[in-house]
Interface confidence: medium
């Protein structure tokens, strides 16, 4: 009973439960390939919980173990549209601090019009998470097609 | 030591560790674009521990951020098959309540023969999450090949 | 306050939080279809706190459910070779001990070149999971492409 | 198939109202960004409004912010335009049109309905 | 705010090639503009033709072409058929969320 009722008074943060799914807002010009990301409940199912946007990449503000998962389609694509169009990419990696940049994630879209994966990595508090898109063609920014998220899973 | 005395007489459901993975039961009739599922551990590895089954459709008991992932492959299929009944579309929603309906996640086959992917949404008590498989082919049955299944995150 | 004490003094490890994510360390012999990896923060990203390898395979430590996740890149791989090269296959299960085989998440690559997915799964101590790659494409060693991982979720 | 069929035009007096629907069927209505797209008579289109497919953010063209609002429910696969303070040069065909979902914002409008009459006149 | 700008009228041979441009009153049209081209034939809604320079859209034939020269976007019809004689608009991203249509080009089919 003591432990019920402590758990409830202890904020979420403190429990670490950091987590962020993120939706499309838009591309960069033509020679950043970086994916620019918005979230939070005025927009519709996405949120920030921890994690913060910085010009529409996130950067993370709690140390520890996260669960990274990314969807990316293609607008208005067909197996043909995506092979005549190849290679079109997406990486997901840390690109600041430049001391940290490594890439995390990379598929190739190949003849598929929508890739997603996820993995467990280690971040650091002030990592920002970049997802870069080459080739020539544009993301869906359906928020069903196009997403992008973190979680905490430990320190 | 108190503490964890305290924490293994709490109970699991208390800490809203909902958790649920399911197997295909079977496909709705021609115009019910529905996989129904099955869970439980006479079936095999599938289990619901919180969520519940309502007809084949998973109903979610607690409110709080989930994390939900499918996998769907198709039956007897080769990407000559599924480029020639394209559009073979998998779609994650919520269906009931009505006013709460919406797409959560979407994946077209184009010349592959299965999707999988994985998304964070907020979902409360009561929202029943559907799986529609719109086109003319057939998902397997294969517990290792189709399942279905979310995760509670945090409130 | 008490409660913020105690939780710090307890070891993570009694908290169930066993994670594991793996890069590629090479392939078996002819007749082994067997992916055989490798962790630890030396060699980059990938870590083990809780399950341990055993020849290049995971063995689980701690009972409970568990969220399995993969990506497999072949290498030098174009739509082109992965549908010339068919039936390439991966499939991740149980293969030790014996009495528990079982293949727990199966994916073919048609004409694509990447495959991920994730399942939960409930996993017992002494567990041994083993990726096997049938086909006579060899999988991308780059730890962005190709990685392996369990995360513990509840008991 | 994917069909749009718009209703509630007709001839109202400046500075009524007019509230126009738009029914879809023949696809996830839930998924897709809408919009309302406008035609003069014998004149070329105007971009109104549109609406993300959650409908938590909207967009104006300028010679219609405040006066007319974009709302839909996906419940009912419908998109609604109400048109308050309503002048002789909103005279038009008001077409519903579905945005393809492409990024950047770039609305590409891969399905249109028919259109519905709106005449502004005393 | 630029305008788009278009011709207000071409006539093309049934065979024939024509081809109609999408301008910017100020500054020249680029891929960040994502041109998008749509028909309107006569008492019919319009209908998506040409997107993002030169995607053709599922179910339009191969003679219809976009692309972008010098400082306008193009579309191009290669052989022309009866059937092409239509309004032709030309919509262009521009900032803020902003997407503007051109006043539109009467092909004629001679």
């Known amino acids: 009973q003591r432990f019920a009722q402590a758990q409830q008074q202890l904020p979420l943060e403190s429990l670490g439960w950091d987590v962020a799914e993120l939706q499309l807002n838009h591309t960069g010009p033509q020679q950043d390939p970086r994916l620019y990301w918005q979230g939070g409940p005025a927009l519709g199912r996405s949120f920030l919980h921890g994690p913060e946007l910085d010009k529409g990449q996130l950067r993370i503000h709690r140390d520890g173990i996260y669960m990274v998962h990314i969807q990316v389609t293609l607008a208005i694509c067909s197996s043909t549209t995506a092979s005549r169009h190849h290679p079109t990419t997406l990486a997901v990696g840390i690109c600041s601090p430049a001391s940290r940049s490594i890439s995390l994630l990379r598929l190739s879209f190949h003849q598929g019009c929508t890739i997603a994966s996820q993995r467990l990595t280690p971040l650091a508090r002030g990592d920002t998470l970049c997802t870069n898109l080459t080739g020539t063609l544009l993301p869906s920014r359906n928020t069903d097609e196009t997403f992008f998220g973190v979680q905490w899973v430990r320190p | 030591q108190r503490f964890a005395q305290a924490q293994q007489q709490l109970p699991l459901e208390s800490l809203g560790w909902d958790v649920a993975e399911l197997q295909l039961n079977h496909t709705g009739p021609q115009q019910d674009p529905r996989l129904y599922w099955q869970g439980g551990p006479a079936l095999g590895r599938s289990f619901l521990h919180g969520p519940e089954l309502d007809k084949g459709q998973l109903r979610i008991h607690r409110d709080g951020i989930y994390m939900v992932h499918i996998q769907v492959t198709l039956a007897i299929c080769s990407s000559t098959t599924a480029s020639r009944h394209h559009p073979t579309t998998l779609a994650v929603g919520i269906c009931s309540p009505a006013s709460r309906s919406i797409s959560l996640l979407r994946l077209s086959f184009h010349q592959g023969c299965t999707i999988a992917s994985q998304r964070l949404t907020p979902l409360a008590r009561g929202d029943t999450l559907c799986t529609n498989l719109t086109g003319t082919l057939l998902p397997s049955r294969n517990t290792d090949e189709t399942f279905f299944g979310v995760q509670w995150v945090r409130p | 306050q008490r409660f913020a004490q105690a939780q710090q003094q307890l070891p993570l490890e009694s908290l169930g939080w066993d994670v594991a994510e793996l890069q590629l360390n090479h392939t078996g012999p002819q007749q082994d279809p067997r992916l055989y990896w490798q962790g630890g923060p030396a060699l980059g990203r990938s870590f083990l706190h809780g399950p341990e390898l055993d020849k290049g395979q995971l063995r689980i430590h701690r009972d409970g459910i568990y969220m399995v996740h993969i990506q497999v890149t072949l290498a030098i791989c174009s739509s082109t070779t992965a549908s010339r090269h068919h039936p390439t296959t991966l499939a991740v299960g149980i293969c030790s001990p014996a009495s528990r085989s079982i293949s727990l998440l199966r994916l073919s690559f048609h004409q694509g070149c990447t495959i991920a997915s994730q399942r939960l799964t409930p996993l017992a101590r002494g567990d041994t999971l083993c990726t096997n790659l049938t086909g006579t494409l060899l999988p991308s060693r780059n730890t962005d492409e190709t990685f392996f991982g369990v995360q513990w979720v509840r008991p | 198939e994917v069909q749009l069929v718009e209703s509630g035009g007709g001839l109202v007096q400046p500075g009524g109202s007019l509230r126009l629907s738009c029914a879809a069927s023949g696809f996830t209505f839930s998924v897709y960004y809408m919009n309302w797209v406008r035609q003069a008579p014998g004149k070329g289109l105007e971009w109104v409004s549109d609406i993300n497919n959650e409908g938590g953010t909207t967009y104006y063209a300028d010679s219609v912010k405040g006066r007319f609002t974009i709302s839909r429910d996906n419940a009912k696969n419908t998109l609604t335009l109400q048109m308050n303070s309503l002048k002789p040069e909103d005279t038009a065909l008001y077409y519903c049109v579905r945005d393809a979902g492409y990024s950047n914002h770039v609305p590409i409008f891969d399905s249109w309905g028919q259109g519905t009459q709106v005449i502004v006149a005393s | 705010q630029a305008v788009v700008t278009q011709e207000p009228s071409l006539s093309v041979s049934p065979g024939g090639t024509v081809t109609l441009t999408c301008g910017l009153t100020s500054g020249s049209v680029t891929s960040d503009n994502f041109p998008v081209w749509y028909q309107q034939t006569p008492g019919q809604a319009p209908r998506l033709l040409i997107y993002?320079?030169?995607s053709r859209h599922s179910g339009v034939p191969s003679r219809f072409s976009g692309s972008i020269t010098g400082n306008k976007a193009i579309l191009t019809i290669t052989g022309a058929q009866p059937e092409d004689e239509a309004d032709y608009y030309c919509?262009?991203?521009?900032?803020?969320?902003?997407?503007?249509f051109g006043g539109g080009t009467r092909l004629t089919v001679l």
């Open positions: 919509a262009l991203y521009l900032e803020n969320f902003a997407n503007e």
């Open positions: 993002t320079i030169n």
